[in-house]
């Protein structure tokens, strides 16, 4: 897109900073915070986005652990390491010299430690349940159209390949939307699962990271789908490494 | 053609600041398009960005973590220039200055102040 | 932050001569790099932006290539004003940063 074209904006991102510096006077942008060139044809992702969210005010999300070892942001809003790329460093710290290892989300998923801790790898997450409850409705919305409209926003919105949309279930009022992503799935240019996911909860926040788009309106044949807690569960593609003082 | 005029002394005794003002013209310094950055040159670090100031809805900063708790740039819409402040500096702060326009490419670039810190 | 490597660090070459000079980041930087020239008591000036974009106004004897981490200038038939010092810049991330210069000399 080029500066003339939309005044120079990242439509994928509002935390960005953005010039026409690109060949042609294009539109060139910056994820706030990290200082991170971003594609704005696609989703920032969401290392950048918490680096970004940091440098403005906060609001800590938290989350529940359905099983083992499924994780959850149990450790609200940190100010994370990216790399170049924009992915979570596998080893994140604190000002206070405190560490931990994350997954590809930024969850973590070890216990904390000291600067000594190592953290070999960035264990990717591949699978997602997005677990929400919709306010009450005259009855129930029918399943298939349902899983069709979340489809549907998941490849238009958010541009996730339909085949990462595992399932889509429902038993009134509880709606789950299965991701699936694992690391040989995922080509060059696809939007990770984690960033739709993270888009998908800011959205159903009303806290939309799109450019000056209006806020998320889901319909199901015309009827209002009103969503009124989301829970997300992460799996990793290596369980997580707690010790058993914290699971007791 | 947009022309960047730098200004500011040439002496700076340790401990003390180093001011600094880029005058433009050919622009705006609360451009909506524009980044108006500090970047300095001496034989030991070669080109080093400090940091930049530009004006989106609101000012943005950012700085080099190596100089991030001394740095002050600083945009002055009455007189459409930006100002550079470090302080306080030691004498391996001694190097050329300069201030450029630009932010995935530097276009246009002052003339350069060679700042020597001395007592 | 991003280190850039250039090489050679000093280039001797005659008027007419085809001179490459390398520039090699540490991490992966897409296409996110410049070229600048500067010659003595001046500023460095833009020759190339998006790794392979010509300025205006700069002579198409100079080139760009590369996307990642490696990346080259080019100057096809090197001119009398062309010597100087020529430096890469990472623009990817910030701190921006730069290569450590390639100065080219008449041999």
């Known amino acids: 897109h080029t500066a003339a074209q939309d005044n120079c904006t990242c439509p994928t991102n509002k935390m960005t900073v953005c010039s026409p510096d690109g060949p042609g006077g294009r539109c060139q942008c910056r994820a706030l915070g990290s200082g991170v060139a971003v594609d704005c044809s696609t989703l920032t992702s969401e290392c950048l986005l918490l680096k970004a969210r940091m440098s403005a005010p906060k609001n800590a999300r938290t989350l529940v652990r359905p099983n083992e070892h499924a994780l959850v942001d149990n450790d609200g809003l940190y100010d994370p390491d990216c790399d170049p790329e924009g992915r979570f460093k596998a080893r994140q710290c604190n000002q206070t010299s405190v560490c931990w290892c994350v997954n590809s989300v930024g969850v973590r998923r070890t216990d904390k430690g000291d600067l000594s801790l190592r953290c070999d790898e960035l264990v990717r997450t591949h699978h997602i349940l997005i677990d929400l409850r919709h306010r009450p409705t005259a009855g129930a919305f029918n399943h298939s159209d349902l899983d069709a409209e979340l489809r549907r926003l998941f490849r238009e919105r958010y541009r996730l390949h339909p085949k990462f949309v595992a399932a889509v279930h429902y038993e009134q009022p509880t709606i789950q939307i299965e991701l699936r992503q694992n690391t040989s799935q995922k080509a060059a240019g696809d939007v990770d699962i984690g960033d739709a996911a993270y888009y998908f909860e800011r959205d159903v926040k009303g806290e939309s990271l799109f450019q000056g788009r209006g806020g998320l309106d889901l319909r199901v044949r015309g009827e209002p789908l009103q969503v009124e807690r989301t829970l997300i569960y992460y799996l990793d593609e290596i369980p997580p490494k707690f010790s058993m003082k914290r699971l007791t | 053609q947009v022309q960047l005029q730098q200004s500011g002394p040439g002496l700076v005794k340790p401990s003390q600041t180093l001011s600094l003002t880029c005058a433009i013209s050919g622009d705006s310094v609360s451009s909506t398009s524009a980044v108006w950055n500090w970047i300095r040159q001496s034989p030991s670090r070669g080109l080093e960005w400090l940091g930049r100031t530009c004006y989106r809805s609101k000012w943005y900063n950012d700085y080099a973590v190596s100089v991030k708790s001394r740095i002050t740039i600083t945009p002055d819409t009455s007189k459409n220039q930006f100002s550079l402040r470090l302080n306080p500096v030691t004498p391996e702060d001694t190097a050329v200055y300069y201030c450029?326009?630009?932010?995935?490419?530097?276009?246009?670039w002052g003339q350069g102040t060679l700042v020597t810190v001395s007592s | 932050d991003i280190q850039l490597t250039q090489s050679p660090s000093f280039l001797s070459a005659s008027v007419g001569d085809r001179v490459t000079i390398t520039c090699r980041a540490s991490q992966g930087i897409s296409s996110y790099l410049a070229w600048y020239q500067q010659k003595p008591g001046k500023a460095p000036k833009l020759l190339i932006y998006?790794?392979?974009t010509l300025q205006s106004g700069v002579p198409s004897r100079f080139s760009g290539s590369g996307s990642g981490t490696e990346f080259t200038l080019t100057i096809s038939s090197l001119q009398p004003e062309d010597f100087a010092t020529y430096y890469c810049?990472?623009?990817?991330?910030?701190?921006?940063?730069f290569g450590g210069g390639t100065k080219v000399e008449i041999k």
């Open positions: 998006a790794a392979s």
């Open positions: 450029a326009r630009g932010d995935f490419r530097f276009d246009s």
């Open positions: 810049q990472q623009v990817k991330i910030y701190p921006l940063t």
